[in-house]
């Protein structure tokens, strides 16, 4: 089975490379997941996303867990997913009404 | 216990080709990417290029673009460098070393370098 | 390309003292910088990641701070084996340059 996911192999300083232009097939029976690397800098925040096998985006994202503090200076969050493009922006939040 | 060892190095002529081996073991290069780092004798560390074994996605530094080719032979656990139009100012010690691609991570093991002499 | 300039470009010290090496990155590179030792005719050994994190094995009289532009690499109390060349790389962007060394010699 084949995933897309979104990939963007330089930081992009506030873009999250989570457009159409972005999406590449990966390769099959190997990258089995999406990995997104989100690291916040004093310049702002930057991104990192590519096809991953499972077992080097587990390795990451396990090794690396205690560098993850969301919305501090210097956190890097590394995430790994399975579903088609779900390295791609996070979902908007519905307004209650 | 995880061990990189390059091997190919040699004396070549300016305009030839070499190709250079990091076999690893201890480990799956699947998992990390390789990065190819060269030292000109009594001089500082140039990344050369690096790859994701995994997909096969490749970056070189300026000074080797469109000279130099980085494979992977995943069945053999072996990263390649394959050195063409070579130059004298290409004569250094060749190390491969793995990184995990988080961008925290650093080369955590390297091999023990093998010497390419560009020399006619 | 972000330049990652280290200085002294040399030193010379005595055993027991305190060292000290600065890295300073053209731009912000937060706290994707590792620090390595050689010594002549072998590979470089990674000492410090992520800016300040010692690595496996590694003495603990090494210690790296710094992040965003300015990073340093102490050495408290030099032993003798620590007479070698150090590098500071950063691991964020691509190429992931290195400094362009800083040996240190005995004085």
């Known amino acids: 089975l084949q995933i897309q996911c979104y990939q963007c192999e330089e930081f992009q300083l506030n873009n999250d490379c989570s457009s159409p232009e972005f999406i590449v097939n990966c390769t099959v029976n190997v990258q089995d997941m999406c990995q997104k690397e989100v690291m916040e800098q004093s310049a702002g925040i930057m991104y990192r996303k590519s096809c991953a096998s499972s077992a080097a985006c587990l390795i990451a994202s396990a090794g690396y867990q205690s560098f993850c503090s969301p919305g501090k200076l210097n956190s890097v969050c590394i995430s790994c997913c399975n579903t088609p493009l779900c390295n791609g922006p996070r979902p908007k939040k519905r307004g209650s009404s | 216990e995880v061990q990189l060892v390059e091997s190919g190095g040699g004396l070549v002529q300016p305009g030839g080709s070499l190709r250079l081996s990091c076999a690893a073991s201890?480990?799956?290069?699947?998992?990390?990417?390789i990065h190819w780092v060269r030292q000109a004798p009594g001089k500082g560390l140039e990344w050369v290029g690096r790859?994701?074994?995994?997909?096969?996605?490749?970056y070189y530094a300026d000074s080797v673009k469109g000279r130099f080719t980085i494979s992977a032979d995943t069945s053999k656990n072996t990263a390649y460098l394959q050195m063409n139009s070579l130059r004298a100012e290409d004569t250094a010690v060749y190390y491969c070393?793995?990184?995990?691609?988080?961008?925290?991570?650093?080369?955590?093991?390297w091999g023990q370098g093998t010497l390419v002499t560009v020399s006619s | 390309d972000i330049q990652m300039t280290q200085s002294p470009s040399s030193l010379s010290a005595s055993v027991g003292d305190r060292v000290t090496i600065t890295c300073r990155a053209s731009?912000?590179?937060?706290?994707?910088v590792a620090w390595y030792q050689q010594k002549p005719g072998k590979a470089p050994k990674l000492l410090i990641y992520?800016?300040?994190f010692l690595y496996s094995g590694v003495p603990s009289r090494f210690s790296g701070s710094g992040s965003g532009t300015d990073f340093t690499l102490t050495i408290s109390s030099l032993q003798p084996e620590d007479f070698a060349t150090y590098y500071c790389?950063?691991?964020?962007?691509?190429?992931?340059?290195f400094g362009q060394g800083t040996k240190v010699e005995i004085k």
């Open positions: 992520s800016a300040s």
């Open positions: 790389q950063r691991s964020v962007f691509t190429p992931p340059a």
């Open positions: 790859i994701y074994p995994d997909s096969g996605a490749t």
């Open positions: 070393a793995r990184k995990l691609w988080v961008s925290l991570a650093a080369m955590d093991y």
């Open positions: 731009q912000d590179v937060s706290t994707a």
């Open positions: 201890g480990f799956t290069i699947t998992n990390y990417g």
